[in-house]
């Protein structure tokens, strides 16, 4: 799937109005300097690809974020404003239902959400030069 045809301004508005607040809520209790992340993405479609990767897929030390409020709102925004996105999600949704429901916030998940915050911030500033 290619995020090129998404309505980026609508997704940005959804991020600013709700998703960003949910990310902050998830991170509550951690210092902003706790995770030294240098994540980057080159343009808005690439940022969304990276956000998709880290929001809906396991990584080392963090099994799942997909049931978190920010993840559900991210999925909704992408489904609404990225044509054809919903069709890519069928298997993932079915697999999700089979997983255990126990929810544990690990330090690694906090680190990953910190990475997501960086990607979203970059998504919102598409004209900035890469560091």
């Amino acid at each position: 799937y290619d995020f090129t045809n998404c309505d980026f301004e609508k997704i940005k508005a959804a991020y600013l109005s709700t998703i960003s607040k949910d990310l902050i809520t998830y991170m509550s209790g951690t210092k902003s300097t706790e995770f030294n992340n240098t994540v980057s993405c080159s343009n808005r479609p690439h940022c969304l690809t990276e956000i998709q990767s880290l929001t809906f897929n396991p990584t080392a030390g963090c099994a799942s974020l997909a049931k978190e409020m920010f993840a559900m709102k991210t999925k909704a925004a992408l489904a609404i404003w990225c044509p054809g996105y919903s069709e890519t999600q069928i298997n993932a949704t079915q697999a999700m239902k089979k997983r255990r429901k126990r929810k544990v916030t690990t330090n690694k998940c906090l680190e990953q959400v910190s990475q997501l915050q960086g990607l979203w911030r970059r998504f919102n500033r598409p004209l900035l030069k890469q560091q």
């Epitope: 799937y1 994540v39 980057s40 993405c41 080159s42 690439h46 690809t49 990276e50 998709q52 990767s53 880290l54 809906f56 897929n57 990584t59 890519t88 999600q89 069928i90 298997n91 993932a92 697999a95 990475q115």
Partner: nanobody, 117 residues
């Protein structure tokens, strides 16, 4: 569908280094999230390192600072540089490639790493 083949395993002394490779053929490698798993004797297979298409990496604490995951999308290859190896790093190392949209995951056949103390 992506097919994966690992290489680079072997027998080393504690404190030494190894570099594992995972070569992919087929389509979809570039955008997939890639993983290295380790399976030690009698222990469940553990995800130890991951890397997104854009190079964002995550590690479990037991390997952080010693292992480095990287990928070359042009060459369809992923690597795991393992430094300061310990006896507890012994196991079969598997690479995996996961479609970030539907969760479909392809696995390599594994490569054995033995660290003698």
């Amino acid at each position: 569908e992506v097919q994966l083949v690992e290489s680079g395993g072997g027998l080393v002394q504690a404190g030494e280094s190894l570099r594992l490779s995972c070569a992919a053929s087929g389509s979809g490698f570039g955008v997939n999230i890639l993983y290295w798993y380790r399976q030690a004797a009698g222990i469940e297979r553990e995800l130890i390192a991951s890397i997104t298409s854009g190079g964002i990496t995550n590690y479990v604490d037991s390997v952080k600072g010693r292992f480095t995951i990287s990928r070359d999308n042009a060459e369809n290859t992923m690597y795991l540089q393992m430094n300061s190896l310990k006896a507890e790093d012994t196991g079969v190392y598997y690479c995996a490639s996961r479609n970030i949209f539907d969760g479909t995951t392809e696995w390599g056949q594994g490569t054995l790493v033995t660290v003698s103390s």
